[in-house]
Structure formats: C-alpha cells, structure tokens
Interface confidence: medium
C-alpha cells in the first residue's frame, strides 16, 4: 500500500505518531468487568498522545495498525489464589464499541501465575474503543510498574 | 507536540532510530541484584545502535518515548523451585541513575513459572541508566534465546 | 549507521513498513513440531504486508531489525496438564532456513501455565524463514485472540 504524494510531503507526525500508555485508575462496579484507565504526566509516567480516554476506556483517533500491549498483576496474589480451586481469572482486551466492530483481540488466563503480559499487532479504526475485561474475583494491582496498558500506531 | 521545521527536514535517522537488544553477560556479586548485559554483533544477535553500555547497564542517549522489553528465564528451574517454598524471585526494570529520576518501570514475579516476559512504553531521557534487578536465590539462564533485554525509540 | 541520500529521499514506505500478524492454521504431522500459520483480511484481523507465507511459515522479504512477537495458548489446558508430570511443553521461534542462518531466537516453556507470550528485537534478512516449534504433547488453541505470531520491521 503506497503512501500518497500528500502523505509523503506532510511532516512526519502526520503519518501518525499516536501513542498512549495508561495506568490503572479503578475497577468497575460489581457487574462491570472492565478496568478503568487513566493517563497523563501529572499521574507519573503515563501519557496520551493522539488516543483519548472516554470514561476510562481508550478511544482510537487515527486509523492504522497498532501494537497493543498490556500487563496486569493481581493484588494480594499467590500461586494458590489463582489455581484451579478458584473461578479462573481471565483478562481480555477487545474492541467494545462501536458494537458493529466488537471483537476480542487478546485474551489470557492467570492459571497459577499472578501476572499476565502480552502484545499484538492489530488494525484499529478511528472511533474504536478498547476495553480490558478482568473476569474472576481477584483484584488488579494499581502499582504503575505492575499494571499498565498501551497502544502504539505503527503504520497506515 | 509538533515536530520543528528543523526536525522535519533532517534525515529520518536524526528523528531517532535508537535501538538496542542485549544478552546477559553475568549476574552481580553477592549483594548486587543487578543483571549485567552485553551487546554487539560479535556476540551473536545482540546490538546497540544509539544507547550504550556503562558497566553492563544500559544508558539512553536520546530523549523520547521508548518501548522497553525484557525476557528472563531462570536456570535449573522447575515450577517447584519458584513456588512459595522459596523466597519469591522478582525482576524489576527501572531507571537507577541519575538518582533524581530513579523509578521502577516494570516489575514481575516468577511465582510458579520459570520465565517472565513483558514490555512497556515509557518516556526516557538522555543519560537515564536502566537497571534490571533480579531478587531471590535463583540464577538466570544465559541462553541468548531465553534471556534478553531491549529498548526501541518510538517517538519524540 | 547513516541512511544513504537515496534512502533519505525515497517515500517513507521504502524504508520498510514490512509487517505481519498471523493466526494459527494447524499443527504439523506427527514428527513435525512446527506450527503452520495463515494471514489475510478474509480470515479476520490477521494480515501480511511485505513478508509472505511459504507452506505456513513466515518468510522475510526485507533486511532490517524486526520486533518479533508471539502468544501461544494451549487448548484443553490446566495448570496440572503443563506441570512436571508431563514432558515439558516448549515453544521456540527461530530462523529455520536458509540452513546457514539457522538459529533459535526466542524460547519459552509453559511450566504450570497455559499461555506463553513474549517479544524480541532481532536482525533478519531477506529470505529468512521463521519457524515456530511447539514440542510436547499438548495442542495449541486456534482462537485468534489466544494464539498469534507477528513481525514488525522497525529500522534498517
């Protein structure tokens, strides 16, 4: 897919430097499995440059292929607390709106670990809102070096 | 944050192609939890293009947002060796100097696993030195496909 | 390593936008530990833009440093099914051809987990074919949000 002449001549940032790294704000109310995120220099090392937050969920503002990454660490966790004696704890990242584009992008279970971390490349479109759903009874750590979620635009 | 006209007109490399992928050299002496890294084509597939090594620790030479990634595999490891019967083994990546910018960027515990792997986006500044601290009694594998640490500049 | 004047003046895509994200197609026959991949918009969110598939294995078409990432989730898996009572299940990503460049790039064992995920930076050359070998008796999930493999060109 070739870049148009206009794209070639625009400053580099116009090709898309969209990037965000978020820290956990809070979990949702009882029946809401979503994690709610926050970002900005005032909060520490999190930031939003292009994407935006809509009620704690990340909204994409530029079409393209993105690298999506996440790490979630469970608080007050030991290998036994995530083992088969409990309802399995699972983390799923997906497009939750618009509804017509709803899909799970990345899913991991904790099994006998207390941290999951992964990343993937995926096409995203302007207006896609990403939700991170944590199912199970265990709570995530809010430490900024243990739980974070980010996206990086990598190409049109 | 817009790129200056000067930045727009410089060759692309001047916007920052800084990148490094390191392999484990050795662990520190008894009371030093840091891992010591090495890099360069003569060693195999590791390299430094921009960042530099200072006594086995990675020093940043260009301001920007970086993707930091790491994988560490424990040697002579089984699920039991990393379980609750042992002092927990934890890996933390952080800025260790200058002292004024000291902070933990990324932290993972091994629990019942023998490998941790993660990545995150974080702003780094020229002169920041990244340290990777492995606490606990288990040793890391020096296999170059099992233990590695890298950074990639992704935007100003 | 400075970019040549020709490189500086070419449209950005000519510097290398090569990128791919693949989903699992199938496992190999009995004695073949390789995973076979597929990609393309008709299949969902997987794609190939530059690299190509050769009998289910990913072939690189442009020299450069790449970020290679993978997530593999085992199907019908519990912590006990990956524990020490079984032959260890291991995933290795490597260059499998040409033979002269054969090397393991990234290796992880499942231990008591059911998912592995990691990423690394590595130099790859035109013609390198990447193979992903899953050893052990457990089968991978073909869910596209649980098992995927991708590469992204990041610099010359």
């Amino acid at each position: 897919q070739r870049l148009s002449r206009a794209q070639q001549q625009l400053p580099l940032e116009s090709l898309g430097w969209d990037i965000a790294e978020l820290q956990l704000n809070h979990t949702g109310p009882q029946q809401d499995p979503r994690l709610y995120w926050q970002g900005g220099p005032a909060l520490g090392r999190s930031f939003l440059r292009g994407p935006e937050l809509d009620k704690g969920q990340l909204r994409i503002r530029r079409d393209g292929i993105y690298m999506v990454h996440i790490q979630v660490t469970l608080a007050i966790c030991s290998s036994t607390s995530t083992s088969r004696h409990h309802h399995p704890t699972t983390l799923a990242v997906g497009i939750c709106s618009p509804a017509s584009r709803s899909i799970s992008l990345l899913r991991l279970s904790f099994h006998q670990g207390c941290t999951i971390a992964s990343q993937r490349l995926t096409p995203l479109a302007r207006g896609d809102t990403l939700c991170t759903n944590l199912t199970g009874t265990l709570l995530p750590s809010r430490n900024t070096d243990e739980t974070f979620f980010g996206v990086q635009w990598v190409r049109p | 944050q817009r790129l200056s006209r000067a930045q727009q007109q410089l060759p692309l490399e001047s916007l920052g192609w800084d990148i490094a992928e390191l392999q484990l050299n050795h662990t520190g002496p008894q009371q030093d939890p840091r891992l010591y890294w090495q890099g360069g084509p003569a060693l195999g597939r590791s390299f430094l293009r921009g960042p530099e090594l200072d006594k086995g620790q990675l020093r940043i030479r260009r301001d920007g947002i970086y993707m930091v990634h790491i994988q560490v595999t424990l040697a002579i490891c089984s699920s039991t060796s990393t379980s609750r019967h042992h002092h927990p083994t934890t890996l933390a990546v952080g800025i260790c100097s200058p002292a004024s910018r000291s902070i933990s960027l990324l932290r993972l515990s091994f629990h019942q696993g023998c490998t941790i792997a993660s990545q995150r986006l974080t702003p780094l500044a020229r002169g920041d030195t990244l340290c990777t601290n492995l606490t606990g009694t288990l040793l890391p594998s020096r296999n170059t496909d099992e233990t590695f640490f890298g950074v990639q500049w992704v935007r100003p | 390593q400075r970019l040549s004047r020709a490189q500086q003046q070419l449209p950005l895509e000519s510097l290398g936008w090569d990128i791919a994200e693949l989903q699992l197609n199938h496992t190999g026959p009995q004695q073949d530990p390789r995973l076979y991949w597929q990609g393309g918009p008709a299949l969902g969110r997987s794609f190939l833009r530059g690299p190509e598939l050769d009998k289910g294995q990913l072939r690189i078409r442009r020299d450069g440093i790449y970020m290679v990432h993978i997530q593999v989730t085992l199907a019908i898996c519990s912590s006990t099914s990956t524990s020490r009572h079984h032959h260890p299940t291991t995933l290795a990503v490597g260059i499998c051809s040409p033979a002269s460049r054969s090397i393991s790039l990234l290796r992880l064992s499942f231990h008591q987990g059911c998912t592995i995920a990691s990423q690394r930076l590595t130099p790859l050359a035109r013609g390198d074919t990447l193979c992903t070998n899953l050893t052990g008796t457990l089968l991978p999930s073909r869910n596209t949000d649980e098992t995927f493999f991708g590469v992204q060109w990041v610099r010359p």
Partner: antibody, heavy 122, light 111 residues
C-alpha cells in the same frame, strides 16, 4: 539420539598446535552451549572451555586461557578447539560435552562424546 | 590442591546402600553450589546422574538420589547393583562461569 564424535587428537611436541573437532547430530545444535572437558590419564575431569549457542561468547579455564580457542559452525553442527603452545600437562582425553541448557552459569553436561586423546611429548 | 574433595574409594555389597560425599576444601557446600554428579565406567565417557543437588537426569534409576548432608553434597545409591561399579565425579559451581570437579570416588561393588 544425541551423538557427539570428537576427532583430531594425536601426538604433538611441546609448543606445537592441534585442532580438535566435534561433530554433533541428533539435536538442534544451534540452541545449545557447548563445552570441552578434559581428563588427564588416571585423573579427574577438568572443564576447559565453553561457547554460547550463537558462537559469540566464550569462556576458558585459567590453565588454557590465551592458548586455546573454542569456536563453532552451526551450519555444520560442529564444535572446534584450537590448541596452541601445547604443554606436557595438556596431555589428556578431550571430551566434547553439551550443556543441558538448565543454566549457563552452572554448566551441566548431559551428553558427552567418547573423547579424543591428545598426547604432548617430545 | 583440589578445591572439591571426594573419598578416593568406597565399597558396597550388592543390594546395599552407600553414600558418596562431595565437600569444599574450605567452607560448606550448599544448594547454591548446584551439586552435580557424573558416573564414569572404564573406557567410557562420563554420564550425567544428578543435577541441582537432587534432580535425577532422565533415564537415571531412582536408586540414585542426591542431597545435602551437613556441609557436603551427597550421592546415595540404595540397592546397589554390579553395574554401579564405576568412578563417580561431583561438580560444584564455585565461580561464574566454570565448574570445579572433585577428584572422583572409585566405587567397588563386592560380590
């Protein structure tokens, strides 16, 4: 089945040179660290040298440092030991040994060749 | 002078139990030395038996076991058999990246 076959041993005068080879088969050679271990006649084992899976990092016992060079060719599944400035005390059976990969801080040799005898004598 | 010490020779009766030890000239052996044991029969290459103090290598019979006894690493053979007659070497991790081997213990199975 893992197989390691050493060759290149023989009689050499003090100060001379010899190159040992080890042909590996039955496993993915490029994944493993490889080692040379020697055993003087009637004596114990002595670790000599190791090389990482890519061939870029090498370590040597103090007794051979500066005289011996370990190398490998992954495309040929082969390990080598170039021995220069040989001394009488280098007389030994030289074994090629695969590191199990459990740790490369702690060499653990899970597969050995049958050895090749090097005799340094005038 | 050897840094790693072993009994030069030991004898056991068929079906009996014998313990071989591996010590340090100065200091105690701990699991941080990652004791490893090898068996060598005459004219053969060494064979890995035990690593990481007490982990049996694949294919090694369970009559072989490893442990730390007091300030030494130990290899215990229970129900000794005639083909256990061999020389046994221990190896300890002392300084990165090398291992030090002991002088070996010649085990004789009487009978």
């Amino acid at each position: 089945e893992v197989q390691l076959v050493e060759s290149g041993g023989g009689l050499v005068q003090p100060g001379g040179s010899l190159r040992l080879s080890c042909a590996a088969s039955g496993f993915t050679f490029s994944v493993y660290y490889m080692n040379w271990v020697r055993q003087a006649p009637g004596k114990g084992l002595e670790w000599v040298s190791d090389i990482n899976n890519e061939g870029g990092t090498t370590y040597y016992a103090d007794s051979v440092k500066g005289r011996f060079t370990i190398s490998r060719d992954n495309s040929k599944n082969s390990l080598y030991l170039q021995m220069n400035s040989l001394r009488a005390e280098d007389t030994a059976v030289y074994y090629c040994a695969r590191d199990a990969g459990y740790s490369n801080h702690v060499p653990i040799f899970d597969s050995w060749g049958q050895g090749t005898l090097v005799t340094v004598s005038s | 002078q050897a840094v790693v010490t072993q009994e030069p020779s030991l004898t056991v009766s068929p079906g009996g139990t014998v313990t071989l030890t591996c010590g340090l000239k100065s200091g105690s052996v701990t699991s941080d030395n990652f004791p490893t044991w090898y068996q060598q029969t005459p004219g053969q290459a060494p064979r890995l038996l035990i690593y990481n103090t007490n982990t049996r290598h694949s294919g090694v019979p369970d009559r072989f076991s490893g442990s730390i006894l007091g300030n030494k690493a130990a290899l215990t053979i229970t129900g000794a058999q005639a083909d256990d007659e061999a020389e046994y070497f221990c190896a300890l991790f002392i300084s990165n990246p090398s291992v030090e081997f002991g002088g070996g213990t010649q085990l004789t199975v009487l009978g």
